[in-house]
Interface confidence: low
């Protein structure tokens, strides 16, 4: 049984243009992070690995920073940028964890009334 | 060959502090978590304290029963990793080992004895 | 906290004989279970990890197997260094915790 759980920002908004932090935790497990990938449905943003560090997919190098910590910096947002962001933590022994956030990006004067996009 | 040297260890008095160390040779120290585990006769072997890796941002986790008392550290550019340990009580009495661990790798120093008494 | 309640508490045993040691999870551990040897120097070297993977550099002789909530580590014949005490480690949630250990005496 896999005891870990992952916490995640949940479902977030940010400006166009802007910037935005997708964060991941993993807890209540003593399994160890071997490497953490972050993806946008089916496209390959990042990868942190334990051993070899930071990789930035080429085609997101202008706008991914990676961090703070096992997180990523998305910046230079744009409308399409809007959907689904998984981080999949591989631990040993457990096994693969995988957190979901929902990112809106909003046009400016939309995200000033502080409209926010939820999921029920 | 892997090595976890260990500080001296030593008598303090109820309520003091003592500080105990580890330096690690022959592996990537920055890779390993790192725990404090101590053994005594009346508990056994009783998981105490561990520190994550660097980007991990160095999350610690503590047993309950050193909780705001215990405090782990590490420097890695000294491949050390440290137990600070505050109002000791006589239950804290016991042989202290530091023991590292990374994917399948395994590794304990020698025990360092602690004994809280008046 | 995962009480693990290790049996028997001592064993007396001879050369080249073949001793099982287990421990029982209180609760669910999947198998995230290691066991240790603790030499009488105090020495501690883990030599299963997984509940039956043998670490590198570990004797054959040494086994480990689990039966539902039961893990068992068995020396199939018995050297003079494997007189020690033995502990099973959950790791499978926090805090870790260990078996209350088995000395095993030579006979």
């Known amino acids: 049984m896999m005891t870990g759980t992952i916490e995640t920002t949940g479902n977030i908004s940010a400006e166009k243009g802007g910037s935005i932090i997708l964060q991941c935790h993993l807890s209540s497990t003593t399994a160890q992070v071997t490497q953490v990938n972050w993806e946008q449905q089916d496209q390959l943003l990042a990868i942190c690995n334990a051993d070899l560090g930071w990789h930035i997919s080429p085609s997101f190098k202008d706008r991914v920073a990676p961090g703070p910590g096992l997180g990523l910096t998305l910046q230079s947002l744009t409308v399409n940028d809007t959907g689904e962001y998984f981080c999949i933590y591989h631990t040993y022994p457990d096994g693969t964890y995988t957190g979901r956030i929902f990112l809106e990006v909003l046009e400016s004067s939309v995200a000033e009334h502080g409209a926010r996009f939820q999921i029920p | 060959e892997v090595k976890l040297e260990k500080s001296r260890g030593g008598l303090v008095q109820p309520g003091g502090s003592m500080k105990i160390s580890c330096v690690a040779s022959g592996f990537t120290f920055s890779n390993f978590w790192m725990n404090w585990v101590r053994h005594s006769p009346e508990k056994g072997l009783e998981w105490v304290a561990q520190?994550?890796?660097?980007?991990?941002?160095?999350?610690?986790h503590y047993a309950e029963s050193v909780k705001g008392r215990f405090t782990i550290s590490r420097d890695d550019s000294k491949r050390s990793v440290y137990l600070q340990m505050n109002s000791l009580g006589a239950e804290d009495t016991g042989i202290y080992y530091c023991?590292?661990?990374?994917?399948?790798?395994?590794?304990w120093g020698q025990g360092i004895s602690v004994t809280v008494s008046s | 906290d995962i009480q693990m309640t290790q049996s028997p508490s001592s064993l007396s045993a001879s050369l080249g004989e073949g001793v099982t040691l287990t421990c029982r999870a209180g609760q669910e551990i999947t198998g995230f279970l290691s066991w240790l040897q603790q030499k009488p120097d105090g020495t501690i070297k883990r030599l299963i990890y997984?509940?039956?993977t043998l670490d590198s550099g570990v004797p054959k002789r040494f086994s480990g197997r689990r039966s539902g909530s039961d893990y068992s580590l068995t020396i199939s014949s018995l050297e003079s260094e494997d007189f020690a005490d033995y502990y099973c480690?959950?790791?499978?949630?926090?805090?870790?915790?260990f078996g209350g250990g088995t000395k095993l005496e030579i006979k």
């Open positions: 997984a509940a039956s």
């Open positions: 023991h590292g661990n990374f994917y399948t790798l395994d590794y």
């Open positions: 480690l959950q790791y499978a949630s926090y805090p870790p915790t």
């Open positions: 520190i994550r890796l660097n980007s991990d941002n160095y999350a610690t």
